[in-house]
Interface confidence: low
């Protein structure tokens, strides 16, 4: 490590013989110290222009001793100005002063880049008292220094209303380069021109940076930090990093991985969350993005079917959530679903087909040749009806589902009656009397209930008069 | 090289909200990929509680639907989640992921923040 | 939502023994995922898509099954392989893990 200590001028005479605490580290000379007799005078030489007299931060005391003895001013004395080390060095510095014994509890205080140093700092103030004056040394120990330990440091000690400060000791910390921008990954489009950027500071400067591509330098000749390296396009993926020099050495950047965007990967586990009898709900599991956000995606959906076309139905949709509810399909069908997604460079291939079925639908006819009577004997209502000629994508007949509305004097109610598909008749109830009943029937299948009839209505008289006039629906064609 | 990294108070008070952020690094947030939170309970039960992609779209669980929200500041390069209403049984360590991709599911974790929910 | 159970839930194994993990899953899978996790860390992604072997992960180690029945199985068991696995599906919504195994060494 580079150590250099540059010492002032020291016009005062050494105390004799090494003083208990004041260690120096090996790149700080003795400090300059009073006889244990005499006072500092006034008179003291700038650190920075030796021999020119300097009257800077002193205290002109003006109280007197009982002999009415003017006392001198006070002062610091002059140390070590700047010190040089490197990183993680132990640093021991001191300030120290000779104050006439009339003065009590002074006290000397550290202080960094005009911010005072308080708590875990290894500040240790020792006295050294004479007859008529004390010798204080202030030492400030720092462990394995840092850069951030960088700067001035200054004492300060207050007396009689007056602050005494002592002059700046200069730490300059010098350490390897340190990256204050280091190149980013990125993810480009091939033969595309990119910027990659790398700055390290110091101390010590200057600091020049290399670039390198996959382990190879890219340039012969150094540049200062900061550097911007332009690469003008790739065709494959590579690795860059930098290299940052210094006099104290070498430090590399981390290596950014620059990708050149491709068109994305197919999707995979498309799956189907649910089947109705015209849509199927499905998702899927993106592919690798080829390092370029997904934009959007393409459901595939082409029916199973020897006697279909073959043709495929696309639906767009937009690339998140991956979910897609396809509609408008088939009843009781067959499909064969895939799923391709695109990015800035194009589409995707499918992803593997999977197989989705339709559940079987709700009839689209209602029963036909519906009549109504009244079977007085009995107080019931007797309802005959055709089965509708149904679709194969309906699905299998399971019963029907007979609505009956009484309406009598602003009052109405409706019923609802469940009967097995075997039925093609069924008894209801008279409900109320001297009122209207009006009948409606629907097919029910698996995929649910299909359009009621056309309404047909009887008239339930009081008791002892029976209208036998029925309604009914005519089949088609038979009107 | 990718590192998540969760940070949130470790207490909150029951009734109150949950809100943790996840710093990534090593990938940006918008460039590809799943954002999302899982939690883990005392007994070590693990939770996908929901995620933000990369363009910004969310998918939450339905068990966690109508408290959670997972947001995101891309200039931070953070993503957030929100979990409001909170009661002891969100007790839990949080952690964030990356999920997606050729993997196709949490490739990268964060190391997790323990959230108590206590008065 | 589809839920995945673990057996055992607790084992022991010795030194060399051959080891197998199983996770069931309530309704069909496309792939399954598996994960360590060892105490006071984070889970690690160990086998993805069913049988793929994370970086880093060990060849004594492998994945199978298909639809409801998956397994995750070590050839031989050594010390540094004692930790809880948990299986993990994303074929459905929500996205659902196992309760665990812990693998415990004799």
């Known amino acids: 490590a580079i150590t250099e200590a540059r010492e002032e001028a020291k016009p005062y005479p050494l105390f004799p013989g090494p003083l208990p605490g004041s260690l120096q580290t090996d790149h700080t000379s003795l400090l300059s110290l009073p006889h244990t007799s005499g006072y500092q005078p006034a008179l003291m030489f700038s650190p920075t222009q030796p021999g020119r007299p300097y009257t800077g931060n002193v205290a002109i005391p003006r109280v007197t001793s009982a002999g009415s003895k003017l006392l001198p001013p006070l002062a610091f004395k002059h140390t070590v100005g700047h010190i040089i080390l490197s990183e993680h060095k132990d640093v021991k510095f001191n300030c120290s002063i000779s104050v006439p014994n009339i003065y009590q509890d002074t006290t000397i205080s550290w202080w960094k880049d005009g911010k005072e140093l308080l708590g875990a700092h290894h500040a240790i103030t020792q006295f050294y008292p004479d007859d008529e004056v004390t010798a204080i040394i202030a030492s400030f120990s720092i462990t394995s220094v840092q850069r951030s330990d960088n700067g001035s440091y200054i004492c300060k000690m207050k007396i009689n209303n007056e602050e005494i400060v002592s002059d700046p000791i200069y730490i300059e910390v010098q350490g390897l380069p340190h990256f204050t921008k280091q190149p980013e990954s990125m993810n480009v489009t091939r033969n595309t021109a990119f910027n990659l950027t790398c700055q390290a500071v110091g101390p010590p400067e200057p600091v020049n940076i290399f670039w390198v591509q996959n382990s190879s330098r890219v340039n012969e000749q150094p540049e200062k930090s900061p550097s911007v390296l332009t690469v003008p396009g790739l065709t494959e993926m590579a690795v860059f990093s930098c290299e940052a020099h210094n006099d104290k050495g070498l430090t590399v950047s981390k290596g950014v991985q620059i990708n050149i965007k491709a068109i994305p990967s197919p999707p995979t586990e498309v799956s189907i969350h649910n089947s109705t009898a015209h849509s199927i709900l499905i998702s899927w599991v993106p592919g690798f993005d080829g390092y370029s956000p997904f934009r959007n995606c393409s459901v595939q959906v082409k029916e199973v079917d020897p006697l279909s076309n073959g043709s495929v139905m696309i639906f767009n949709t937009s690339a998140s959530p991956h979910m897609y509810q396809i509609k408008q399909l088939q009843a009781l069908a067959n499909y064969s679903i895939g799923v391709s997604c695109m990015n800035e460079i194009g589409w995707s291939a499918v992803s593997p087909w999977i197989l989705a079925s339709t559940t079987e639908g709700a009839p689209s006819v209602a029963p036909l040749n519906v009549t109504v009577f009244l079977n007085e004997s009995r107080d019931n209502v007797d309802i005959r009806w055709m089965k509708p000629l149904t679709k194969r994508q309906a699905g299998e007949l399971v019963g029907y589902r007979i609505s009956h509305v009484w309406q009598s004097a602003g009052i109405s109610k409706e019923l609802l009656e469940e009967v097995g598909q075997n039925n093609s008749r069924a008894q209801i109830s008279v409900q109320v009397h001297n009122a209207t009943c009006t009948v409606r029937i629907a097919a029910v299948t698996k995929g649910g209930v299909g359009p009621f009839s056309d309404p047909v209505k009887i008239f339930i008289p009081a008791h002892g008069w029976v209208d036998h006039a029925p309604s009914s629906t005519p089949a088609p064609g038979n009107a | 090289d990718v590192q998540l990294q969760e940070s949130g108070p470790g207490l909150v008070k029951p009734s109150q909200s949950l809100s943790l952020t996840c710093s990534v690094t090593?990938?940006?947030?918008?460039?590809?990929?799943?954002w999302t939170w899982i939690r883990q309970f005392p007994g070590n039960k693990l939770e996908w509680m929901g995620y933000?992609?990369?363009?910004?779209?969310?998918n939450y669980n339905p068990s966690l639907k109508n408290r959670i929200s997972i947001t995101r500041d891309t200039s931070k390069n953070q993503f957030f989640l929100n979990l409001n209403s909170v009661t002891t049984e969100d007790t839990a360590t949080y952690y964030c992921?990356?999920?997606?991709?050729?993997?196709?599911?949490?490739?990268?974790w964060g190391q997790g923040t323990s959230v108590t929910v206590s008065s | 939502q589809i839920v995945l159970t673990q057996s055992p839930a607790i084992m022991s194994a010795s030194p060399g023994e051959k080891v197998t993990i199983t996770c069931r899953a309530s309704?069909?899978?496309?792939?399954m995922h598996w994960f360590q996790q060892k105490p006071g860390t984070s889970p690690k992604l160990w086998i993805y898509?069913?049988?793929n072997l994370a970086s880093g992960v060990p060849a004594r180690f492998s994945g199978s099954g298909s639809g409801t029945s998956y397994s995750l199985t070590i050839s031989r068991m050594e010390a540094e392989d004692a930790a809880t696995y948990y299986c993990?599906?994303?074929?459905?919504?929500?996205?659902?893990f196992g309760s665990g195994t812990k693998l415990e060494i004799k």
């Open positions: 992921a990356r999920e997606g991709g050729r993997l196709r599911t949490m490739d990268y």
């Open positions: 090593g990938y940006s947030i918008t460039g590809g990929y799943y």
């Open positions: 933000i992609s990369y363009d910004g779209d969310n």
């Open positions: 309704s069909s899978v496309n792939y």
């Open positions: 898509t069913t049988s």
């Open positions: 993990q599906q994303r074929s459905s919504y929500p996205f659902t």
